[in-house]
Interface confidence: medium
């Protein structure tokens, strides 16, 4: 069940983590010790659904986590918009050498809905994420940190949905959203002619030839 | 619901050290800031510090920095406040008290103290 | 450290008659994300303290809504509309933009 967001007309959300009422329910790997799913709030006092994971002490650290399938619905090119925060590592004692600033964002294609495990090699890459800005101690003192904001798009797609994956390998990051959308062109009508709404192609240049329609009471 | 247990009432003598536990139920231990604040008594209300058990090391006033030390133990859910070298002024109830994070589009914060412990009395007392 | 200032430090009022505490703090509270940082808390006598009202104006989960909070910047008042007897009790306003966090001296309320 998800609530309503707002969000540019040209825009359609596949998964938004922020909406979801309830556990979100992702699979991480290992099961215990790595990725950890944290209740916290917005400003309506609504719970939202957070992933967290902190093991900034210990080496060689390499902590999965991955969403549910995500149907692309005829998507060629979908986006990845996450919102995190990141601890910055020079506010943390004694950490050095195992402490990182980065995490890894990863897709799989597959037209199985139910995958249960996570098989890193099926995975491939989109990018290594940083903060713009990483917070200190005195953030969290002062009891305010700022939210990035990344967006990645992935394509050309071909398979019905695939899956999103977070690989940690030793950062202090809080994942408070993940929202997968793709955009199309709206219903638009020209010199008496519709034409329907339709899905971008898959690179963000490319032309989509659409048939258009003529108007009530018009005609070719 | 939620709920903070404190460890029971201690008395000590000066020089010494405390340590008072926290144990929390019913939320998510590492998603929300934990607080000790005393009070002296018939007196007001003092911060002393606090940890979000995910993010780690703690934030102390300086008033008590170098004999506070809050640390968390997610595995039990628990938070401990330890002061050291203690003096007959640090006769006081000391409370934990949660702040859950709170995000909007732009930032996280940590809101009010939501849920209180039910308080440990602490007697420094030759 | 940011110091708060609450008057009156006693209040007496009749029940079913309204209050008003103030709050005033050494520089200002309101953050540029628009939120002002300033908490109301309660505490009944032989209870530990329990939080009304967060972010200068929003009631917390289960009280009532004859407990309100105003204000901005540096000053804050919290009105009781129509006082109970079960709102006896020291109420502490409580600055939370920047560590250390401070509580105001505290302002006792009591029945006539």
């Known amino acids: 069940v998800t609530g309503s967001r707002v969000y540019p007309a040209n825009e359609v959300t596949l998964l938004d983590s922020r909406s979801v009422q309830g556990e979100l329910g992702w699979i991480a790997s290992p099961l215990e010790g790595g990725w950890e799913e944290v209740s916290i709030m917005d400003e309506k006092n609504t719970p939202i659904r957070t992933y967290q994971v902190c093991n900034v002490m210990e080496p060689s650290q390499n902590n999965w986590l991955r969403t549910d399938w995500i149907t692309r619905e005829g998507a060629q090119r979908v986006y990845i918009e996450i919102k995190f925060t990141l601890r910055d590592c020079n506010s943390l004692p004694g950490v050095m050498g195992t402490c990182k600033e980065t995490f890894n964002l990863y897709y799989y294609e597959s037209d199985n809905d139910k995958e249960r495990f996570i098989r890193e090699n099926q995975f491939v890459k989109i990018d290594t994420i940083a903060a713009d800005e990483s917070f200190t101690q005195v953030d969290i003192g002062d009891r305010i940190m700022k939210l990035n904001t990344e967006i990645r798009d992935v394509g050309p797609l071909s398979k019905k949905g695939f899956y999103l994956a977070f690989q940690d390998v030793g950062a202090c990051i809080a994942l408070v959203s993940v929202r997968v959308f793709y955009k199309k062109c709206p219903l638009t009508v020209r010199n008496l002619a519709q034409f329907p709404d339709t899905i971008t192609g898959a690179d963000t240049s490319s032309l989509v030839e659409v048939r258009g329609s003529c108007v009530n009471n018009s005609e070719e | 619901q939620v709920q903070l247990q404190q460890s029971g009432a201690e008395v000590k003598k000066p020089g010494s050290s405390v340590k008072v536990s926290c144990k929390a139920s019913?939320?998510?231990?590492?998603?929300?800031?934990m607080h000790w604040v005393r009070q002296a008594p018939g007196q007001g209300l003092e911060w002393m510090g606090g940890?979000?058990?995910?993010?780690?090391?703690?934030n102390y006033a300086q008033k008590f920095q170098g004999r506070v030390t809050i640390t968390a133990d997610k595995s039990t859910s628990t938070a401990y406040m330890e002061l050291s070298s203690l003096r007959s002024e640090d006769t006081a109830v000391y409370y934990c008290a949660t702040a859950p994070m709170v995000c909007s589009s732009t930032s996280c914060y940590l809101r009010g103290f939501d849920y209180w412990g039910q308080g440990t009395l602490v007697t420094v007392s030759s | 450290d940011v110091v708060m200032t609450q008057s009156p430090l006693s209040l007496p009022v009749t029940p079913g008659e309204p209050a008003s505490i103030s709050c005033r703090s050494s520089?200002?509270?309101?953050?540029?994300?628009?939120?002002?940082?300033l908490d109301w808390y309660l505490q009944k006598p032989g209870q530990s303290p329990q939080l009304l009202i967060y972010l200068g104006s929003n009631r917390a989960s289960g009280v009532p809504d004859r407990f309100s909070g105003s204000g901005s910047g540096t000053d804050f008042t919290l009105k009781i509309s129509r006082v109970e007897a079960e709102d006896v009790g020291v109420y502490y306003c409580m600055q939370a933009l920047q560590t250390p966090i401070t509580f105001g001296q505290g302002t006792r309320l009591e029945i006539k």
């Open positions: 520089q200002s509270l309101l953050h540029s994300n628009g939120y002002n940082y």
């Open positions: 940890i979000i058990p995910i993010f780690g090391t703690a």
């Open positions: 019913g939320y998510t231990f590492t998603g929300y800031y």
